[in-house]
Amino acid sequence: KVILDKYYFLCGQPLHFIPRKQLCDGELDCPLGEDEEHCVKSFPEGPAVAVRLSKDRSTLQVLDSATGNWFSACFDNFTEALAETACRQMGYSSKPTFRAVEIGPDQDLDVVEITENSQELRMRNSSGPCLSGSLVSLHCLACGKSLKTPRVVGVEEASVDSWPWQVSIQYDKQHVCGGSILDPHWVLTAAHCFRKHTDVFNWKVRAGSDKLGSFPSLAVAKIIIIEFNPMYPKDNDIALMKLQFPLTFSGTVRPICLPFFDEELTPATPLWIIGWGFTKQNGGKMSDILLQASVQVIDSTRCNADDAYQGEVTEKMMCAGIPEGGVDTCQGDSGGPLMYQSDQWHVVGIVSWGYGCGGPSTPGVYTKVSAYLNWIYNVWKAEL
């Protein structure tokens, strides 16, 4: 049976086997087409989600679709039901928490009172001044907290206590990519991880350990990527994996936070990378132990210079490494998180591509997660 499962797929009505390589090849090989059902699916960027959270204390902002202007949500008459609606608009199903925070001196958006209309937040028509003088600080999910804070050094062995959101994404029990837990159902990774194998069946996620072989595998229900754009072939290197069963969070299995929409990190901002990838550029093998390293944001202009990536790094990517080189992600780290710590840990990047590993002028290039928040929210909403 194991051999059959490894090399063949069983079609129903009438029952017969087809070679596994015919799964997800774009041809209907089973009479009912089930060989093309459980495949990596693409999902468009979709419409603008009309709510967002700012890095200014996770304050809620609402879009006026008529004018295209954004407004900050006033705390006056804001309720748990409105908080749930806001989070549902972003695709969250968990119970949110919210609190009042004082309107700051740098508040640049108009502040309006919020109401609800057909399960979407709206601005109250006759909105007067914000009497409470407070904004809504909203958290849709408890995230980005670990049991242990890493020390700032070069490269060292990591503990799952520090990075409880890190997962190993495996095909046929072989580690292919890293990934990050975003909520009980969803794992964030890179789209290029699925280039070779587009059938969902054989992909598994392993969570809760820093050692590659030692933890149970979780079944995957769906793998979703963005529609391919030939004008920007290296953009959109992002994928969401929906797990068949929700994760139970613990000290070693927890979600990382998504970045805020306005999370602009300046050059030299310290960041962290983790993974089980190659420790040498051309070989060796995967590391059995999770490794961690501190890096920093590298200016896109520098990264696009003639001796570096020559303009290939787009607005939806970011570079990170250390100026002198030597610390970088490598093959096998793909899909894993590039992380920034403020109050919580945020996944600001996804390990995507680069020329070599650790070269001084060619640092790692990462998918900029904040550029894809809209897509993530639209996927989640479609799957609620």
Epitope: E45, P47, N229, M231, Q310, G311, E312, E315
Partner: antibody, heavy 116, light 107 residues
Amino acid sequence: QVQLVQSGAEVKKPGASVKVSCKASGYSFTSHYMHWVRQAPGQGLEWMGWMNPNSGNTGYAQKFQGRVTMTRDTSTSTVYMELSSLRSEDTAVYYCARLGQQLDYWGQGTLVTVSS
Amino acid sequence: DIQMTQSPSSLSASVGDRVTITCRASQSIRNYLNWYQQKPGKAPKLLIYEASRLQSGVPSRFSGSGSGTDFTLTISSLQPEDFATYYCQQSYSAPPTFGPGTKVDIK
């Protein structure tokens, strides 16, 4: 510096095929998609399709599906565009181009004239 | 496919004039809009990418604005070498499509 050098002008009869070449230099050939765009005399620009020189994968505009084939020779860093079943309305200048944010480079163009 | 329209289709202007060309997409393309300049017998040249970002080496008299469906290319002070045809192009989704062009000639 990046250069895309195309083959010379061609005159073809209706029903025939034409194969235009585009030789790339000054960058890593397999790292960038190549696109083909055409422009009929006095008309606008029309995108035909793309090729990934690394994998050989291609994508064609619906209008040209079944008539266009894009291939590459990595040993010479050359991409080819072949258009078959030519008709008079295929008379145009054909450009190869490396497109994308900030990465815009075009060949000098190849005039293909289809005439009986 | 996303349709792109441009207006005007042609315009006559003098050196030093401020020139504005508009481009409209049949659906929202966010800021995935490029502007090209083409002179007779030459390949197109990229001026502006992502609606408002100036391509390296392009004079600062060229600027772009807009997002969603409506976009504008502005030449603040027309120079003799700017007489050409200008095309907008969306790169939001495949296939990339071009506007029909705006010819700018000497008054």
